[in-house]
């Protein structure tokens, strides 16, 4: 499956749009800062079957809607941005859908290795367990936003990495 | 391979302006903000003020505000420290640094070779 | 602002030596603090970050630790190239402050 070049488009305009939700100077949450021990080794992306390192950029980018459709979130940031954002993620999951139902099954067998799905789920889960112990506060939201950021670059490469070995 | 390059060193007189650069590559340089650092002969670091290259958001060191104006140009991945009217007392060695924003990585972690100032009549 | 303070400001010791540094914040930083290493001539160089966090390249003799206001930077065993001035330096909160330096030289 070829990832069609509307989905690179789509995901630097995600990256946009999450830059510009923006909403207060960032140098006052320094003492926000958190690790969220992001799963880099799941992006490497060198020992994977192409199967899976779809799934991983799928779930990165359900878990990020899931994420941005909260109460909470509608809340914290920007609606207009917010339905921008909702709008490119969810045409990049229907493309990587597509490559999912290809790649993942092989003669009626599934290719997956669950760990690196359960990986990125379990990254996410430290990220909505912060938001919930810092009670959702703008800085805290900022800090996830910067770290929604930072995956999504990590997803970006592990695309062209994706792309070079086609 | 990260870099940091600085102008080259600036001999001045009082009174006269002055702009430095420091330019990013081997990374995104927006992902990443850009710190000013003074040392002065002899003695220890100052921190000055921190740019956010994606929006150019600034935060000075209220010991330098005022003192020093901090921009920068994302098309060219370059931080500037500038001077409007220099005193003697800005002669001082000038380093610019990578700081990872709000993400979760190391401070400061790549640094510019310095731009030496010296002012004087 | 915060201030540091380190102490000593300057120390002499022998090749092999343990040496420990340490620094203070008025407030507490949580660990938000790196140590910086910063030879003659030669822009500083991150050692230690998040207090404890050792900055890859950076040989394994460099530790650190302490969180709040109390931190400590130890070489544990001193090689030639080690002689050199350490500061810490809060990333707490903006204006983000460095300590006053602390010179290690040979005894």
């Known amino acids: 499956c070829d990832l069609p070049q509307t989905h690179s488009l789509g995901h630097r305009r995600t990256m946009m749009l999450l830059a510009q939700m923006r909403r207060i100077s960032l140098f006052s949450c320094l003492k926000d800062r958190h690790d969220f021990r992001f799963p880099q080794e799941e992006f490497d992306g060198n020992q994977f079957q192409k199967a899976e390192a779809i799934s991983v950029l799928h779930e990165v980018i359900q878990q990020t809607f899931n994420l941005f459709s909260t109460k909470d979130s509608s809340v914290a940031w920007d609606e207009r941005l917010l339905d921008k954002l909702y709008t490119e993620l969810y045409q990049q999951l229907n493309d990587l859908e597509a490559c999912v139902m290809q790649e993942v099954w092989v003669g009626g067998t599934p290719l997956m290795n669950e760990d690196s799905i359960l990986a990125v789920r379990k990254y996410f889960q430290r990220i909505t367990l912060y938001l919930t112990e810092k009670k959702y506060s703008p800085c805290a939201w900022e800090v996830v936003r910067a770290e929604i950021m930072r995956s999504f670059s990590s997803s970006r490469n592990l695309q062209e990495r994706l792309r070079r070995k086609e | 391979e990260v870099q940091l390059v600085q102008s080259g060193a600036e001999v001045k007189k009082p009174g006269e302006s002055l702009k430095i650069s420091c330019k990013g590559s081997g990374y995104s340089f927006t992902s990443y903000w850009i710190g000013w650092v003074r040392q002065m002969p002899g003695k220890g670091l100052e921190w000055m003020g921190i740019?956010?290259?994606?929006?150019?958001?600034?935060r000075y060191s209220p010991s330098f505000q005022g003192q020093v104006t901090i921009s920068a140009d994302k098309s060219i991945s370059t931080a500037y420290l500038q001077w409007s009217s220099l005193k003697a007392s800005d002669t001082a060695m000038y380093y610019c640094a990578r700081h990872p924003g709000l993400n979760w990585a190391p401070d400061f972690d790549y640094w510019g070779q310095g731009t030496l100032v010296t002012v004087s009549s | 602002d915060i201030q540091m303070t380190q102490s000593p400001s300057s120390l002499s010791a022998s090749v092999g030596d343990r040496v420990t540094i340490t620094c203070r914040a008025s407030q507490s930083i949580s660990s938000y603090l790196n140590w910086y290493q910063q030879k003659p001539g030669k822009a500083p160089k991150l050692l230690i970050y998040?207090?404890?966090s050792l900055q890859s390249g950076v040989p394994s003799r460099f530790s650190g630790s302490g969180s709040g206001t109390d931190f400590t930077l130890t070489i544990s065993s001193l090689q030639p190239e080690d002689f050199a001035t350490y500061y810490c330096?809060?990333?707490?909160?903006?204006?983000?402050?460095f300590g006053q330096g602390t010179k290690v030289e040979i005894k």
């Open positions: 998040a207090a404890s």
């Open positions: 330096q809060q990333s707490y909160s903006t204006p983000l402050t």
């Open positions: 740019i956010d290259p994606s929006d150019s958001d600034t």
